[in-house]
């Protein structure tokens, strides 16, 4: 690596992937192993993120960019940059502080993450229940009762008196 020739800041010519090394008369030195600099003119290289524990490496660190992590099977990312991994649950369940719990009656979750949500209240739209809800699936609303042929009936369950919970982080 050539010594920079800038008269103002001798470090300004050090490219990404290097740092301006004060121990070597401000020569541009390559980043040490497992470190990077994503911009030029840096006086230190940043140490690469290590994907450990429930994290696994999605993108390896290079001399110019940090590593990126995702989660091992059975877990999913939470937050920007996959800052945490949260345990997966089955469809029809939600994660609580005590682990995965089945959705209460009147609620459902069709994913392996997130919270149980109340079934749609078809009657609010003036419709009837065409297909009953389950722990894994929302109800399917059909035509309004007035649209049904004479003699047909439909039961709309009351909306559950339950606040949706929040998955612990």
């Amino acid at each position: 690596f050539e010594r920079t020739r800038s008269l103002q800041d001798p470090c300004s010519n050090c490219p990404a992937g290097t740092f301006c090394d004060n121990n070597r008369n401000q020569i541009c030195s390559p980043c040490p192993p497992n470190s990077f600099s994503s911009a030029g003119g840096q006086r230190t290289c940043d140490i690469c993120r290590q994907c450990k524990g429930v994290f696994r490496t999605r993108k390896e660190c290079s001399s110019t960019s940090n590593a990126e992590c995702d989660c091992t099977p059975g877990f999913h990312c939470l937050g920007a940059g996959c800052s945490m991994c949260e345990q997966d649950c089955k469809q029809g369940q939600e994660l609580t502080k005590k682990g995965c719990k089945d959705c209460c009656f009147g609620t459902f979750n069709d994913q392996k993450r997130g919270i149980c949500r109340p079934w749609t209240n078809c009657s609010l739209d003036g419709k009837s229940v065409l297909v009953n809800g389950t722990k894994e699936r929302d109800v399917v609303c059909g035509p309004s009762p007035a649209d049904l042929s004479p003699g047909a009936s439909s039961v709309t369950p009351p909306a559950p008196a339950r606040e949706p919970g929040h998955s612990p982080q």
């Epitope: 192993p33 690469c48 450990k52 800052s83």
Partner: antibody, heavy 118, light 112 residues
Framework: QVQLQESGPGLVKPSETLSLTCTVS????????WSWIRQPPGKGLEWIGY???????NYNPSLKSRVTISVDTSKNQFSLKLSSVTAADTAVYYC????????????WGQGTLVTVSS | EIVMTQSPLSLPVTPGEPASISCRSS???????????LDWYLQKPGQSPQLLIY???NRASGVPDRFSGSGSGTDFTLKISRVEAEDVGVYYC?????????FGQGTKLEIK
Amino acid sequence: QVQLQESGPGLVKPSETLSLTCTVSGGSISSYYWSWIRQPPGKGLEWIGYIYYSGSTNYNPSLKSRVTISVDTSKNQFSLKLSSVTAADTAVYYCARDQSGGGSFQHWGQGTLVTVSS
Amino acid sequence: EIVMTQSPLSLPVTPGEPASISCRSSQSLLYSQGYNHLDWYLQKPGQSPQLLIYGGSNRASGVPDRFSGSGSGTDFTLKISRVEAEDVGVYYCMQALQTPPTFGQGTKLEIK
């Protein structure tokens, strides 16, 4: 280059809450973990906890019930609150940039001494 | 939690002579691709700690090359090839494999 600066009261009464703020300059608070570490006078280092810029936290189990770390990305700051303090919480408190969520503290603040006394 | 044990706790050295500090962890710090989650820090008198070595053997950028780290698994060593007066302070090893990260009790290097 990245610089960190701790600020907050140097004296806290027993049973009250210790509150400190770390201001990050020379770089964005985004994309990194940010830790608090403390050192009682004449003793070794103890990690308190970290926060990611998105708000995710992880605390030392020995302090978890008393610790809250928060972040304000608009001000490039993160903060520590430690409740129900006793004399044993007297220490120099450091903020540091944490490269991997509990490892390789590459940039440190200069530290601030907090004394717990009535 | 992982317990870190350093030796010696005090290390008087003559300038220009080598120095060596040992650090042992209660469980292996070796992780994927041969990466050891072990850092070394130096805390000079009246200052905050500074990172010297990460990953067991990687010298942080800007750290003089007289400092080197070695070892794997549970046994690690920090070596200073020729001690200088500015190297005085307390040296800490720290495991970064598991939360909470934990530090050794420190080794105080002083000039004879």
